[in-house]
């Protein structure tokens, strides 16, 4: 049930496809935190 945002994309997933499935405020927070970490050269939980 309790799930960290992934470090890497699963098969056939894009950032856009994940963005379209986010539901909670926490989901969006983790997603944008992940994006920020990705810009820095590595995925972030």
């Amino acid at each position: 049930k309790h799930k960290c945002f992934r470090n890497s994309l699963e098969n056939n997933e894009t950032l856009e496809s994940i963005m379209n499935t986010l539901e909670s405020e926490e989901d969006f927070r983790k997603y944008f935190y992940y994006l920020e970490g990705s810009k820095g050269g590595g995925g972030s939980k």
Epitope: K1, T21, L22, S24, D27, F28
Partner: antibody, heavy 119, light 107 residues
Amino acid sequence: QVQLVQSGGGVVQPGRSLRLSCAASGFSFSSFGMHWVRQAPGKGLEWVAVISYGGINKHYSDSVKGRFTISRDDSKNTLYLQMNSLRAEDTAVYYCAKREGYRYAYDYWGQGTLVTVSS
Amino acid sequence: DIQMTQSPSSLSASVGDRVTITCRASQGISNYLAWFQQKPGKAPKSLIYGASSLQSGVPSKFSGSGSGTDFTLTISSLQPEDFATYYCQQYNSYPLTFGGGTKVEIK
């Protein structure tokens, strides 16, 4: 404690409209996505729609797409399902349901409200 | 869409019996599977999430297992209050889909 209290069901003629409501309490409603699930008489459960936090994302089942609209009013802690162009096959008990987020299971359900579409 | 196939669709059992219900997904869903119990005229009740984790307040006689495409719900010792219909649901991707249900009846 978490409560989801539904209202708005009833009998309606084919082609007409109806709006269901789901009043939430006991949790931070505005922070979570909310779902509608329905169950036709004597049948199984069918997912209908979801609305995300802030209404950013909305998704619908193919069976209701273009006819039903999911919305929320965070100032009233209330979820809505606007049902237009109703058909006999939309007759069902409609449930609202909460989950913690993307890829989480439902943890709370409303009590259900019956919608009967009949002439 | 991911199809969820539940079996059996109904079963008869006695109090004290061990009951197993299976659910198969048409494609892999990791462990994003939930089980619900529903009694006539009532809303579904969440039993298990993540294929094997018990929801808060659910007795330990319920257990779930599986990953990928094949899953099971087991009731270790059936009690009178357990006679109900049970549904599995995948929440790996939209549209979220449910199994057809398994009605557990008194033998």
